[in-house]
Interface confidence: low
Amino acid sequence: KVILDKYYFLCGQPLHFIPRKQLCDGELDCPLGEDEEHCVKSFPEGPAVAVRLSKDRSTLQVLDSATGNWFSACFDNFTEALAETACRQMGYSSKPTFRAVEIGPDQDLDVVEITENSQELRMRNSSGPCLSGSLVSLHCLACGKSLKTPRVVGVEEASVDSWPWQVSIQYDKQHVCGGSILDPHWVLTAAHCFRKHTDVFNWKVRAGSDKLGSFPSLAVAKIIIIEFNPMYPKDNDIALMKLQFPLTFSGTVRPICLPFFDEELTPATPLWIIGWGFTKQNGGKMSDILLQASVQVIDSTRCNADDAYQGEVTEKMMCAGIPEGGVDTCQGDSGGPLMYQSDQWHVVGIVSWGYGCGGPSTPGVYTKVSAYLNWIYNVWKAEL
């Protein structure tokens, strides 16, 4: 049976086997087409999600679809039901928390009172002044907190206590990529991890340990990638994996926060990378122990210079490394998080591509997660 399962897939109606390589090849090889059902699926960017959270204290903003203008949500008459609606619009199913925060002197958006219509937040028509003088600070999920804070050094062995959202994504029990837990059902990783194997069946996620071999494997229900853009073939290197059963959070299994929509990180901002990837370019082997390293944001202009990536780094990507080189992600780290710490840890990038590993002029290139928040929210909403 093990051999059969490894090399063959069982079609129903009538029962017969087909070679496993015929899974997810775009052709209906089973009469009912079940060989094409459990495959990596693409999902369009979708419409603009009409709510968002700002890095200014996680304050809620609402889109007026008629004008295309964004407004800050006033705390007046804001309720738990409105908080739940806002989070559902972003695809969250967990119980949100919210509080009032004072309108700051730098408030640049108009502040309006919020109401609900057809399970979407709307601006109240006759909205007067914001009497409370407060904005809504909203958290849809408790995220980005770890038991241990890493020390700021070059490269060192990591503990799962520091990075409880890190997972190993494995195909046929072999580590292929890293990934990050976003909520009980969802793991964030890179689309290119699934280029070779597009059948969901053999992919597993392992969470809760910093050692590659030692964690229980979790079944995957869906793998969703964003649609390919032929104009920018390296863009859209992002994927979401939906787990078959929700994770139970613990000290070693916790979610990382998504970035805020306006999370613009300036050059030299300190960031962290983690992974079980190759410890040497073109050789070495996967690290059995999770490794961590501190890096920094590298200016996109520098990254696109003639001696570096020559314009290949688009606005939906970001570069990170250290100016002198030597600290970088490598093969096997793909899909893992590039992380920024403010009050919580945020996954600002996904390990995507680069020339070599650790070269001074060719740092790691990462998918910029803030560029894909709309897509993530639309996928989650479709799967609620």
Partner: antibody, heavy 121, light 107 residues
Framework: QVQLVQSGAEVKKPGASVKVSCKAS????????MHWVRQAPGQGLEWMGI????????TYGHNFQGRVTMTRDTSTSTVYMELSSLRSEDTAVYYC??????????????WGQGTLVTVSS | EIVMTQSPATLSVSPGERATLSCRAS??????LAWYQQKPGQAPRLLIY???TRATGIPARFSGSGSGTEFTLTISSLQSEDFAVYYC?????????FGQGTKLEIK
Amino acid sequence: QVQLVQSGAEVKKPGASVKVSCKASGYTFTSYYMHWVRQAPGQGLEWMGIINPSGAGTTYGHNFQGRVTMTRDTSTSTVYMELSSLRSEDTAVYYCARGPRDTAMVRFDYWGQGTLVTVSS
Amino acid sequence: EIVMTQSPATLSVSPGERATLSCRASQSVSSYLAWYQQKPGQAPRLLIYGASTRATGIPARFSGSGSGTEFTLTISSLQSEDFAVYYCQQYGSSPGTFGQGTKLEIK
């Protein structure tokens, strides 16, 4: 097996519009791009544009921009090509052709049987 | 856009003989070249893609070669069903463009 079945021949007057359909079967409809290619009588092949059935994104050839609209209906696995402001030089056989999803400008591995559109006053 | 030029316009060859069709691109298209066969009243059929890879179900007598700007389709031993019009198409640059065709006829 993969099949692309197109609607029947059409005769149109100059200035009118025509809408040709192409029904796909035998594969996952949203996993492949669909292109439209036309061939005037006794002439070569001319690429008109592409639609992504998964997200309905389109790219049209320069010669057809402003006159062509490509749409799809995922419930029936059908793509449509509408050409407006018809002129006599639009008389041609119009083909839908399937192309893999990993790159937009690509070989066409399966073709519809073609739909003859005649534009005549 | 890239202009594809096929030669000759018509090629007369006897059954059993070898036929060589040429296609030239106005600028490099790397190996992004396909060949199609079209018979009267039928849709084109993919023969070769990637300049040299035979499509599924295409007999081994069809072979493609070349890269950059010069490409060749060779039919090693012509069968009666091979007499048709052959088109080359580049897909290395948008929009994909076709050659004007080579008519392969019985000598």
